[in-house]
Interface confidence: low
């Protein structure tokens, strides 16, 4: 991934095609690595940040991470290689449209990351209960 | 189907301008990101510019920044390329492109394209 302040021009070792003969082209996330959130006990917050970005790679998908600890919040929204692990996890819904948020086991925090293909998709992240019912009980702390 | 037209290009001189166009069906034109790219006589594809589905945001390649500026009309259906202060170095064939736009085997990329050509 490359931060938006140091983009590379963009250029044809960008453009690959899949097995299908169809052109992959990077996608756009929103990409303002890590900043201060107010981003708490909602159903769904949008990411507030500015800037959005190419991806570097083509295979690259949109991420965000949601962290609370008893000093902060912060939301962290960049570009990932779904291959290849994001905080020692793997990115499991990276194919998913919509970003929706499944809370990882970190301790010390409350840790919640979601992947999407879809362009700008991580500026809307979501903990609704429509989407996310696998954890009934978290959801009663999240909407307390 | 897809379908992409592009249209606009021709012969101008060293530090003219030119205004590419490209009509677009077949999709929800509003919800893609477009893209411009080209091919030079005898060498292969690359970026120009690239625009979100809003047109809230534009990218460029550092050979073209402060040149040309890409634009869309989504009521229209319609995607620009505006070519200011061109080069010779800017001739090729333009090309319009959205996220999984098939390529026509053993024909062009993405339709006809529309060829610039920059020389006195």
């Known amino acids: 991934t490359i931060p938006p302040h140091v983009q590379k021009s963009v250029n044809n070792d960008m453009i690959v095609t899949d097995n299908n003969g169809a052109v992959k082209f990077p996608q756009l996330c929103k990409f303002c690595d890590v900043r201060f959130s107010t981003c708490d006990n909602q159903k769904s917050c949008m990411s507030n940040c500015s800037i959005t970005s190419i991806c570097e790679k083509p295979q690259e998908v949109c991420v965000a991470v949601w962290r609370k600890n008893d000093e902060n919040i912060t939301l962290e929204t960049v570009c990932h290689d779904p291959k290849l692990p994001y905080h020692d996890f793997i990115l499991e819904d990276a194919a998913s449209p919509k970003c929706i948020m499944k809370e990882k086991k970190k301790p010390g925090e409350t840790f919640f990351m979601c992947s999407c293909s879809s362009d700008e998709c991580n500026d809307n992240i979501i903990f609704s209960e429509e989407y996310n019912t696998s954890n009934p009980d978290l959801l009663l702390v999240i909407f307390q | 189907e897809v379908q992409l037209l592009e249209s606009g290009g021709g012969l101008v001189q060293p530090g003219g301008s030119l205004r590419l166009s490209c009509a677009a069906s077949?999709?929800?034109?509003?919800?893609?990101?477009m893209y411009w790219v080209r091919q030079a006589p005898g060498k292969g594809l690359e970026w120009v510019s690239a625009?979100?589905?809003?047109?809230?945001?534009?990218y460029y390649a550092d050979s073209v920044k402060g040149r040309f500026t890409i634009s869309r009309d989504n009521s229209k259906n319609t995607l620009y390329l505006q070519m200011n202060s061109l080069r010779a170095e800017d001739t090729a064939v333009y090309y319009c492109?959205?996220?999984?736009?098939?390529?026509?085997?053993?024909?062009?990329?993405w339709g006809q394209g529309t060829l610039v050509t920059v020389s006195s």
């Open positions: 077949g999709f929800t034109f509003g919800q893609e990101s």
């Open positions: 492109a959205k996220s999984g736009t098939r390529i026509k085997q053993g024909f062009d990329y």
């Open positions: 625009i979100s589905g809003s047109g809230g945001s534009t």
